[in-house]
């Protein structure tokens, strides 16, 4: 997904909540078996931190080789380090696997800042803290890379969970999740709970910390509070959604809603920031600056290039506004909103000079490829990627960082008209994105 702190039009009517209750996930709809309830074995199976990505343990080959794999909903290749690299503690050794099959085909994936290339093959893959199944999946064995692996991140590969349309070298290369669903009885759905720490983690703390959960094949009720609200997946390539309204502290940005989705809006666990199109970014920053004007912050901070620090424990969360994104609902003329706190969009980083300060980076940045709802957004919510019903669900995460005064929220329904007009019709191009 995009390296940057990857590693990027109609207003509608956002009114008061409707009096009537519109159907949503919590209604008494029949569900297929295995969709609901508890997935104890999968809870807490992610580690990492928003700035370097969240990873799950996977095994590849026979006998199984264990690797940590970045969970990336913004790409569609399963790719692992397969050669020595200074930032890798271990790598996939194809020659040691009796079940490896060479596809005799190369793959090259460039990013804005970096690239990886490798050789395609298939092998047996399983997820120890996932469903009790083994699948034969396509694997890109990374033999060369530039600015792809991150020093100290503790992951050795990437699990692209998006659709075949953006797979490299082309859409004929079946993504891992498609293989999983085809070859097993796992339902065509996964859900992610990414848990931001709220404070910087050093290397040993990351290794010891719990980063969240990837529930494969279902929804775990213990991971969220309140109701799940669903937005349609507009097109199955990235996990593309439509934003119909944006508010800063309840104040509408009042832009043509096409601008919010220019040229697309995606949900991407492999991107650190909330990335907004240029015009939207400028309007949002102007509004956030105005709301937080009791303190002066340097230009470099708003550009994501400079830290701001406060004495430990004195961060003035209250001066920063909440940000609400209204998403198209499942019912005509109905939307819902997700609201994040500064605890999500100010990313804690270690101050190299002194441990007496709490230091943060502004984790909203400019994009030339549309809106990217990265870890900054996802850390506030439990996000359900319901591929079977072509929709993405949001509920307040049980692990999101907040204070005693405000909490992240998922609220609705709201009346919003002409939401279809908010989508931008993009000329077809193949572009894939990774953690900044």
């Amino acid at each position: 997904t995009q390296h940057g702190i990857r590693l990027p039009l109609r207003s509608g009517l956002g009114g008061a909540p409707l009096g009537l209750r519109l159907p949503r996930e919590t209604d008494e709809e029949p569900e297929e078996p295995g969709r609901r309830g508890s997935f104890v074995e999968m809870v807490d199976n992610l580690r990492g931190k928003s700035g370097q990505g969240y990873y799950v343990e996977m095994t590849v080959g026979s006998p199984p080789q264990t690797l940590n794999i970045l969970v990336d909903t913004g790409s569609s290749n399963f790719a692992v380090g397969a050669a020595p690299h200074p930032f890798l503690h271990r790598y996939y050794q194809r020659q040691l696997s009796s079940t490896y099959r060479d596809l005799r085909k190369g793959v090259y994936v460039p990013y804005t800042q970096g690239k990886w290339e490798g050789e395609l093959g298939t092998d047996l893959v399983s997820i120890p803290h996932g469903p009790n199944v083994t699948v034969r999946a396509n694997i890109a064995a990374i033999t060369e890379s530039d600015k792809f692996f991150i020093n100290g991140s503790n992951w050795e590969g990437i699990l692209g969970l998006a659709y075949a349309e953006i797979a490299r070298p082309d859409d004929s290369l079946e993504p891992f999740f498609d293989s999983l669903v085809k070859q097993t009885h796992v339902p065509n759905l996964f859900s992610l709970q990414l848990c931001g720490a709220g404070f910087p983690l050093n290397q040993s703390e990351v290794l010891a910390s719990v980063g969240g959960s990837m529930i494969i094949g279902g929804i775990d009720h213990s991971l969220y509070t309140g109701s799940l609200w669903y937005t349609p997946i507009r097109r199955e390539w990235y996990y593309e959604v439509i934003i119909v309204r944006v508010e800063i502290n309840g104040q509408d940005l009042k832009m043509d809603c096409k601008e919010y989705n220019y040229d697309k809006s995606i949900v991407d666990s492999g991107t650190t920031n909330l990335r907004l199109p240029k015009k939207v970014f400028e309007a949002a920053v102007k509004s956030i600056k105005a709301a937080s004007s009791t303190e002066k912050f340097p230009d470099g901070f708003w550009l994501g290039e400079q830290l701001v620090c406060w004495q430990a424990g004195t961060t003035p969360w209250n001066i920063f506004p909440v940000i609400s994104l209204y998403l198209m609902g499942e019912v005509t003329n109905q939307s819902f909103r997700i609201t994040i706190l500064p605890q999500q969009y100010l990313r804690p980083v270690e101050d190299v000079a002194t441990s007496q300060d709490d230091c943060y980076k502004f984790a909203i940045s400019q994009s030339s490829t549309g809106t990217v709802m990265g870890a900054v957004i996802m850390e506030g919510f439990y996000v359900v990627f319901d591929r079977a019903r072509k929709r993405i669900g949001f509920a307040v995460s049980a692990c999101h960082v907040h204070d005693e005064f405000r909490t992240a929220a998922v609220e609705g329904p709201f009346v919003t008209l002409d939401m279809e007009d908010c989508g931008y019709n993009i000329p077809q191009t193949d572009e894939s994105t990774l953690m900044t």
Epitope: Q113, K147, D299, G300, L303, E305, Q366
Partner: antibody, heavy 118, light 107 residues
Framework: EVKLMESGPGLVAPSQSLSITCTVS????????INWVRQPPGKGLEWLGV???????NYNSALKSRLSISRDNSKSQVFLKMNSLQTDDTARYYC????????????WGQGTTVTVSS | DIVMTQTTSSLSASLGDRVTISCRAS??????LNWYQQKPDGTVKLLIY???RLHSGVPSRFSGSGSGTDYSLTISNLEQEDIATYFC?????????FGGGTRLEIK
């Protein structure tokens, strides 16, 4: 070890353009922004512009129309291009690394002297 | 643009003296003030960032203070190697701007 080194033409004729390269080592251009600063003989320091980690740029408004900063990440090089040089562009040109932790230029090159003269 | 002014362009002091160099901003810069040392050979080094924080490797005889629009750099015990020109610079607003410099000489 962090190092920045400027290399330039030394002498430029009036109305011609200037190209200077800053070659860095010990860090990545995708992790640290690079700024250009100049100092005319016997005068103070003047900030010219910056290329941020994502590749976007900001320039000194007085020189914006004549300036362009670009980079080649793979070669760890940053380029300053300035058009329509006049004699008052004679200066020592420095590249300097910006550190967001400090909000300051934490490492500087040794500078390269550019003389604009016919 | 924020204008940075160092009213004293040159300063003479004796070795061992306590020397203070001042800098004024045309508006409140909220402590986003850095100090640099430029040696006679043109080499530039960061001394102090965010008004008072010492950059790594800088001797503790250097200190900084100030707030709002007025800032100062103090050298508590002047040494021969401190002979240089000192520049202040604000990092609150783009374009980043420098003071005119204060040249320190030995009496």
């Amino acid at each position: 070890e962090v190092k920045l080194m400027e290399s330039g033409p030394g002498l430029v004729a009036p109305s011609q353009s200037l190209s200077i390269t800053c070659t860095v080592s010990g860090f990545s251009l995708t992790s640290y922004p690079i700024n250009w600063v100049r100092q005319p003989p016997g005068k103070g320091l003047e900030w010219l512009g910056v290329i941020w980690t994502g590749g976007s740029t900001n320039y000194n408004s007085a020189l914006k129309s004549r300036l362009s900063i670009s980079r080649d990440n793979s070669k760890s090089q940053v380029f300053l291009k300035m058009n329509s040089l006049q004699t008052d562009d004679t200066a020592r040109y420095y590249c300097a690394r910006w550190d967001g932790y400090f909000g300051a230029f934490d490492y500087w090159g040794q500078g390269t002297t550019v003389t604009v003269s016919s | 643009d924020i204008v940075m002014t160092q009213t004293t362009s040159s300063l003479s002091a004796s070795l061992g003296d306590r020397v203070t160099i001042s800098c004024r901003a045309s508006q409140d810069i909220s402590k986003y003030l850095n100090w640099y040392q430029q040696k006679p050979d043109g080499t530039v080094k960061l001394l102090i960032y965010y008004t008072s924080r010492l950059h790594s490797g800088v001797p503790s005889r250097f200190s900084g203070s100030g707030s709002g629009t007025d800032y100062s750099l103090t050298i508590s015990n002047l040494e021969q190697e401190d002979i240089a020109t000192y520049f202040c610079q604000q990092s609150l607003s783009l374009p980043y701007t420098f003071g005119g410099g204060t040249r320190l000489e030995i009496k």
